[in-house]
Amino acid sequence: MMTGTIETTGNISAKKGGSVILQCHLSSTMAQVTQVNWEQHDHSLLAIRNAELGWHIYPAFKDRVAPGPGLGLTLQSLTMNDTGEYFCTYHTYPDGTYRGRIFLEVLESSVAEHSARFQIP
């Protein structure tokens, strides 16, 4: 029985060239979190945080992705191409799979209004 819910940072905006934290939080379940996957809009994996193995950042993103804080993910040196959907997938036992969605909009430096709660200056 999947009783949990995922809270995310929702729709966020960040400045081109800057950084942003993607954050999800699983609540309302006692399930064990064994792994968290971070994926981009085109289904490509950015990073995995495994309970035993720790973080694995996929090679294509090594230069621009930093693990954390917590189970979150920090995207650096943002480009306009980073605009789009990001998904956190929590693999848990005994519940199974929970998925959260974040929409990131990367704005030109001159336009950026920093609405993101987890924004890094």
Partner: antibody, heavy 119, light 107 residues
Framework: EVQLVESGGGLVKPGGSLKLSCTAS????????MSWVRQSPEKRLEWVAE????????YYTDTVTGRFTISRDNAKNTLYLEMSSLRSEDTAMYYC????????????WGQGTSVTVSS | DVQITQSPSYLAASPGETITINCRAS??????LAWYQEKPGKTNKLLIY???TLQTGIPSRFSGSGSGTDFTLTISSLEPEDFAMYYC?????????FGGGTKLEIK
Amino acid sequence: EVQLVESGGGLVKPGGSLKLSCTASGFTFSSYAMSWVRQSPEKRLEWVAEISSGGSYTYYTDTVTGRFTISRDNAKNTLYLEMSSLRSEDTAMYYCARKRRDYYGMDYWGQGTSVTVSS
Amino acid sequence: DVQITQSPSYLAASPGETITINCRASKSISKYLAWYQEKPGKTNKLLIYSGSTLQTGIPSRFSGSGSGTDFTLTISSLEPEDFAMYYCQQHNEYPWTFGGGTKLEIK
């Protein structure tokens, strides 16, 4: 080349025990969660058990909980399934399978080892 | 447990044809369905995962679609080596469960 080779199957009486092994090669065994899946004589597939990469987490289907134990020895690149209190409905071909690194499905399977529970 | 109903259980087709196999889950499994191919004397092969993502090394004539409760495996322009048994499996919640299988034979 990724290879998974099961062994240890055989004929056993109801209530008996058996220990299956699966020897892995061609990949970093300690980086992957592993599963046992069985196929009944009627060709139905059933997920049996799973173990995390380091062995800290083990999961079972309800029908085998308390009777089967999944374990692994990462130094020996080997996965195990210890089966006790065997029943006729446990008769099946038992396969070990590697879980994808991202946990989406099982990307490599062994050839299987046959277990028959009969008096 | 999530029940998976796979149809048809048997399918006869000719090389070059396009076929579809369906799987229906007893409740929503989001996009988390995998498809496998089973052939005698060979190890089971993962074809598709997460509903529509093609496993590395699998020919593009295999495709998957669907989300929620209804999923489809399509094999376009059948090759002789495609005649085999096919199974779907949900990887959304424990225990992982499989469909009953589809035997694809040459007409």
